[in-house]
């Protein structure tokens, strides 16, 4: 019989008492085969973290700073359940740490030196740890003691709870630095008042502070937020302009064998029976013998944290950077205005080899990081382990939902001004063998399908989106008799046609021979009835252009396109017979890397782009013998995006809507995790 006990860790007598009450009340409402609670008492949160890691306890609820400690080795804990605040309809699990300024003050984030600062309190998250952690490497050396470095960075401050004797500048704007509401500039509202009164130039608070203090929109319009990219935004655009997004209060468990499903089952049932306004005799979010015992008193309920989400992703790049800077106190030696090498994310070993060659040729400008799937690469870019990669539009959508931004677009047509003219896109097509003359768009049911990969534009999002509109369900593996759609569940019929050996079967990378445009076309040639690819795929792999044994004798005339009106046309008539226009592949990165990635890639394409004529004797960035490694092989240049610099603007309303409709069919664990952080 599996042990269905969750050992909750309590950090005080009062918590232990509440835990026992929780245990007893749960026993009274949950069947004997359901989850149960046991209580473990420890002296501190850090002791609880260690106990969970050592399998002496299973769960505890932590503030963000402690979630970071819990994640660090050797603890390796992960977030499993989040408390939410507000309403069930609009649950808030995060708050945003922001830098508020007056509208007419004219400086940016990188010009804070010499300004006057208002903080909620020394050592507090939004008011101190996050802003000072993010500014850490701009502070004058020596950076220890930290208070002295901060005092020397700003021209004056109010940092309640600081030592006014040792660091008088930190108390210059609020004499005495009182650590309670007796100090008019203490806490969130106090720090904002410090700005409002004109004592300070910037207030470090949370996003809701300004709304709680200024009910009138006209008053709020006198303030702006400083963004990390050295721009400003209105105060209601905090989701796009903040210092960090911080989880409020989170249940953590072991990463391996951590009982996360059981913990969720327990807490979900607990909130049903003892949540807000549910029961008089025991209330989960109430602490008669103290404050915030086990859970925050202000919580309204729990949400399950998506399983793909580790602590780094949950806390977010900015928060992790800030806390790591404060804890480790290390800064790069290079001057900050110089670009560090761009860490390119390469998929599996084929791309890694090409990336390594690029790295050798780039003279220190490019480094390489490997991952097994595109989603793993996106996650690495999010958390700073990697910086950039070029993505199909379907993954630009996921990357965008995860906070990444497009920086340059692949262009596929030769033109005089290639780098300045991003193209409208390419065509997604359905290809069949000419010999299968009865096959049309309207009778694909039961046929064998070949896809570039799940989640990609031409190979999945466009054809499956169109199909979904017709069949109104997501069971595409039942619609086709079998197929190869790399990235599908291994036991799916959409992995049956794939050719990868062993663990590589149906993997969404080049270890699967039927992956990508060329792979999907090969699948059609060798096994399938229809391939969903781009309009250039057939000509690029026929007429001797692909020397591989399977392709060298193929003839373009032996293939036709399926049109949406039920007719068929020759391959060259793609402009009048396609499924949809697809946005070109694009390079994505984190916002903080945007300028450097742009600069370095433009240099790199001038050295190794399509101006290089002899690719056998020189490194060519856009060539890999039809394998589309790192970039599509038909890339002519990487083009500036001009104002199409967000994923929505880049992909276009129509495509974003189409992918949004397919979201109900999405198997992307990363998309699920990212929409948890930003619904």
């Amino acid at each position: 019989v599996p042990d269905k006990t969750v050992r909750w860790c309590a950090v005080s007598e009062h918590e232990a008492t509440k835990c026992q009450s929780f245990r007893d009340h749960m026993k009274s409402v949950i069947p004997s085969d359901g989850p149960s609670v046991a209580c473990v008492k420890k002296a501190s949160y850090l002791d609880c973290i260690r106990a969970i890691a050592a399998n002496e306890a299973d769960a505890v609820t932590l503030d963000a700073g402690l979630v970071y400690d819990a994640y660090l080795a050797p603890n390796n804990l992960k977030p499993v359940v989040a408390e939410f605040y507000g309403s069930k309809e609009d649950p808030q699990t995060f708050y945003y740490a922001v830098a508020v300024v007056k509208k007419d003050s004219g400086f940016q984030m990188n010009q804070l030196r010499g300004k006057k600062s208002c903080h909620t309190g020394l050592g507090r998250s939004a008011g101190w740890n996050i802003p000072i952690g993010l500014l850490y490497c701009d502070l004058p050396e020596p950076r220890k003691p930290l208070e002295k470095a901060v005092a020397n960075f700003f021209s004056g401050s109010c940092a309640p709870c600081a030592d006014g004797t040792d660091f008088p500048q930190l108390c210059q704007l609020c004499p005495g630095c009182g650590c309670s509401t007796l100090n008019q500039y203490f806490g969130y509202s106090g720090a904002f008042k410090c700005l409002k009164d004109g004592a300070g130039d910037v207030a470090f608070v949370k996003h809701s502070t300004i709304f709680e203090n200024l009910a009138n929109k006209a008053d709020r319009d006198q303030y702006e937020l400083l963004c990390l990219d050295n721009t400003r935004k209105p105060v209601d655009e905090y989701k796009d302009c903040h210092l960090a997004q911080v989880p409020s209060h989170t249940v953590v468990a072991r990463s391996m064998g951590g009982k996360e499903d059981l913990i969720w089952e327990l807490l979900n049932q607990a909130q049903e029976h003892f949540g807000k306004d549910k029961s008089k005799e025991f209330q989960l979010f109430s602490s008669p013998h103290g404050k915030d015992l086990l859970f925050k008193d202000s919580a309204h309920g729990f949400l399950k944290v998506p399983p793909r989400m580790d602590a780094k992703m949950y806390l977010g790049y900015e928060y992790v950077t800030a806390i790591r800077n404060l804890r480790e106190g290390t800064c790069p030696e290079a001057p900050t205005d110089e670009c560090k090498p761009v860490k390119w994310c390469a998929l599996s070993h084929h791309e890694r080899l090409k990336c390594d060659e690029w790295s050798v040729n780039s003279v220190g400008k490019i480094e390489c990081v490997s991952a097994e799937t595109t989603e793993d690469c996106i996650a690495k870019i999010m958390n700073g382990e990697a910086d950039a990669m070029s993505l199909d539009g379907g993954f630009v959508y996921i990357a965008g939902k995860c906070g990444l931004v497009p920086v340059l677009a692949e262009n596929y047509n030769k033109s005089d001004n290639c780098e300045d003219t991003p193209e409208a896109g390419y065509f997604a097509i359905a290809v069949v063998k000419k010999s299968a003359s009865d096959l049309t768009w309207d009778n694909l049911k039961g046929k064998k399908s070949c896809h570039t990969a799940v989640g990609r534009t031409a190979g999945w999002n466009i054809p499956m989106g169109l199909l979904y509109n017709k069949i109104n369900h997501c069971r595409f593996d039942e619609f086709f008799s079998e197929g190869c759609a790399p990235g599908s569940k291994k036991d799916s019929s959409l992995c049956k046609l794939c050719m990868g050996s062993g663990l590589n079967l149906c993997e969404p990378n080049n270890k699967e021979g039927y992956y990508g445009y060329t792979g999907a076309f090969r699948c059609l040639v060798e096994k399938g009835d229809v391939a969903f690819v781009k309009h250039q795929t057939v000509p690029q792999n026929t007429g001797g252009k692909n020397p591989d044994p399977w392709a060298k004798n193929l003839n373009e005339k032996d293939y036709e396109l399926l049109c949406l009106d039920g007719t068929r046309k020759p391959v060259e008539e793609y402009a009048n017979c396609h499924l949809a226009r697809a946005p070109n592949h694009a390079v994505v990165t984190r916002k903080d890397k945007e300028a450097c990635v742009h600069k370095i890639l433009r240099q790199q394409q001038h050295l190794f782009g399509s101006n290089v004529t002899d690719c056998s004797g020189n490194f060519c960035l856009f060539r890999s013998e039809t394998k589309d490694l790192l970039f599509r092989d038909d890339t002519v240049c990487l083009a500036k995006l001009h104002d199409r610099n967000t994923y929505e603007k880049y992909l276009g309303e129509e495509y974003v809507k189409a992918v949004g409709n397919l979201r109900k069919c999405s198997t992307s664990s990363l998309l699920e995790a990212c929409t948890f952080r930003r619904p």
């Epitope: 084929h350 791309e351 080899l353 090409k354 390594d356 060659e357 050798v360 040729n361 003279v363 690719c615 056998s616 004797g617 020189n618 490194f619 890999s624 013998e625 394998k627 490694l629």
Partner: nanobody, 117 residues
């Protein structure tokens, strides 16, 4: 097709030196980039050092200052001079000509380097 044959490995004490050679059966003069990789048991194959046709080099952080890569286009050979060897340098060392290696798994047999006292 150019075949690559690695040699020069062996057993050496910590602090010792070895010089690996990679001989090509055809011309390497036109190959854009040549490189040495290594693979320790249970680990991924990793780039140790690379050299472009023009002589630009790159080294893994773990070998910087200890290893030197060079190429002799006339002799169709690439070398890896390894000094101040450490136990963690123990691995099979492979040489590759990038112009083919990422289209097909184009690797030689490699040469075993063991650093042990």
């Amino acid at each position: 097709q150019v075949q690559l044959v690695e040699s020069g490995g062996g057993l050496v004490q910590p602090g010792g030196s070895l010089r690996l050679s990679c001989a090509a059966s055809g011309s390497i003069g036109s190959s854009a980039t040549m490189a040495w990789y290594r693979q320790a048991p249970g680990k991924q194959r990793e780039l140790v050092a690379g050299i472009t046709r023009g002589g630009t080099t790159k080294y893994a952080d773990s070998v910087k200052g200890r290893f030197t890569i060079s190429r002799d286009n006339a002799e169709n050979t690439v070398y890896l001079q390894m000094n101040s060897l450490k136990p963690e340098d123990t691995a099979v060392y492979y040489c590759t000509d990038y112009s083919r290696s990422y289209y097909e798994d184009h690797w030689g047999q490699g040469t075993q380097v063991t650093v042990s006292s």
